[in-house]
Interface confidence: low
């Protein structure tokens, strides 16, 4: 409520992020030809990626390209990399689409399928759609803790959203528990009108909002949290313009004194928090 | 388990003839869908890259060294691949070994890194005289 009287200040916030989930991941993978189902068991380690300032990352999908060492080979089977002859192939053409560098010969890539040969991390990276069902599709049961502490120096206030006493096996819910900083990350989703398992497959960015409306004066103090969540990525992008959110690692190894990587494609949710509100005192 | 048995290795004069074979048995190893390729190892020289054939469309690839010289060639049916050494040189001297990848997706197709193949022979001896 604005106060005429008061002086308002912005508030300058620090925020710090705990994930906690198991997923089991049934991952289909072909061995000696066979296809095998294989499960393993996905913790925090292996989920959530460091991130720069106020974001964390939860991974919900991915593409494996394993084995990968830098040789020669054939590109993998696009419009572009299509070739019948050496001639539709340029040495030392790097294509920004490509994964590598062009030698100038057309090679047998599988059956009658000829392609440009590059040198690069070997084998290509397949193009292939995002697993359906997303693989760890259970990450709606994560959940995160928020950590929110915040600051008016100017009125020379500091607070947190995490008060001494407050039940830490809560869980977020907009009406019966408003205050809890533990937020179930399939909530966040039906909050904002959204179904996780959609925005699983290809990834997604969702905000997390946290307002802070305090009034400081002695008689009439209050300072606490509202929480809200809005959809950040455009659901609407068509697929030329690369809809949700991914991006590629790689795990290094070697084998027999050969650099190897397993290359891999994550799709996953990023999550911003973005701390506004401001801070009134006569 | 995989195995891979070279013959036809012998003493043979310089520009002569040879037909080195190799046979893959095992359960685990799908013939029809492997790289198969030859590599040799003269006495105090590193492995050296020969000739190898992709099992889709019989492509061939071979070393600078014996192009024109040397036809690879497979017989499905038989689990047999075969190279064939024309015009023979004293340097063509070594150990040649029979080599086979399997791969179970496209990609990988760097035929003379013997780090690609998965399975290798024992060697059979070739010796060139002048």
């Known amino acids: 409520s604005d106060k005429l009287y008061q002086r308002k200040e912005p508030v300058i916030s620090s925020v710090h992020t705990k994930v906690k989930g198991i997923a089991e991941v049934k991952e289909e993978i072909v061995e000696n030809g066979v296809k095998k189902l294989v499960h393993s068991v996905f913790d925090t380690a292996d989920y959530t990626f460091p991130l720069q300032g106020n974001s964390f990352f939860v991974m919900t999908n991915f593409l494996k390209t394993e084995g990968q060492e830098q040789r020669l080979c054939p590109e993998y089977p696009t419009r572009r990399t299509l070739c019948s002859s050496d001639r539709g192939c340029k040495k030392g053409w790097m294509d920004p689409q490509s994964k590598g560098i062009q030698t100038g010969r057309c090679v047998v890539y599988e059956g009658n399928q000829k392609t440009c040969e590059v040198s690069a991390w070997c084998p290509i990276e397949a193009v292939e759609e995002a697993p359906r069902p997303a693989l760890l599709n259970s990450a709606e049961n994560f959940t995160v803790l928020i950590k929110n502490n915040i600051d008016f120096p100017g009125h020379n206030y500091t607070t947190r959203n995490i008060l001494p006493g407050l039940n830490i096996t809560c869980t977020f819910h907009k009406t019966q528990n408003p205050q809890c900083p533990i937020f179930r990350l399939g909530d966040i989703f039906r909050e904002t009108g959204d179904n996780f398992s959609d925005v699983a497959i290809q990834g997604g960015i969702m905000g997390i909002e946290i307002y802070w409306d305090c009034n400081l004066d002695r008689w009439f103090h209050h300072c606490r949290p509202k929480y809200s969540f809005r959809r950040l990525d455009d659901k609407t992008t068509n697929v030329s313009l690369y809809p949700g959110y991914n991006f590629r690692y790689a795990k290094y190894y070697k084998e027999n004194n050969v650099e190897k990587r397993t290359l891999i494609k994550v799709f996953g949710i990023r999550f911003d928090i973005l701390v506004f509100g401001t801070g009134g005192k006569f | 388990e995989v195995q891979l048995v070279e013959s036809g290795g012998k003493l043979v004069q310089a520009g002569g003839s040879l037909r080195l074979s190799c046979s893959a048995s095992?359960?685990?190893?799908?013939?029809?869908?492997?790289?198969m390729g030859w590599f040799r190892q003269a006495p105090g020289k590193e492995l050296e890259f020969v000739a190898a054939i992709d099992w889709s469309d019989f492509n061939t690839y071979y070393a600078d060294s014996v192009k024109g010289r040397f036809i690879i060639s497979r017989h499905n049916p038989r689990n047999s691949v075969y190279l064939q050494l024309n015009s023979l040189k004293p340097e063509d001297t070594a150990v040649y070994y029979c080599?086979?990848?399997?791969?179970?997706?496209?990609?990988?197709?760097?035929?003379?890194?013997?780090?690609?193949?998965?399975?290798w022979g024992q060697g059979t001896q070739v010796t060139v005289s002048s």
């Open positions: 080599a086979a990848h399997s791969e179970t997706r496209g990609g990988t197709r760097y035929f003379d890194r013997p780090s690609l193949y998965n399975y």
């Open positions: 095992g359960r685990t190893f799908s013939f029809s869908t492997s790289t």
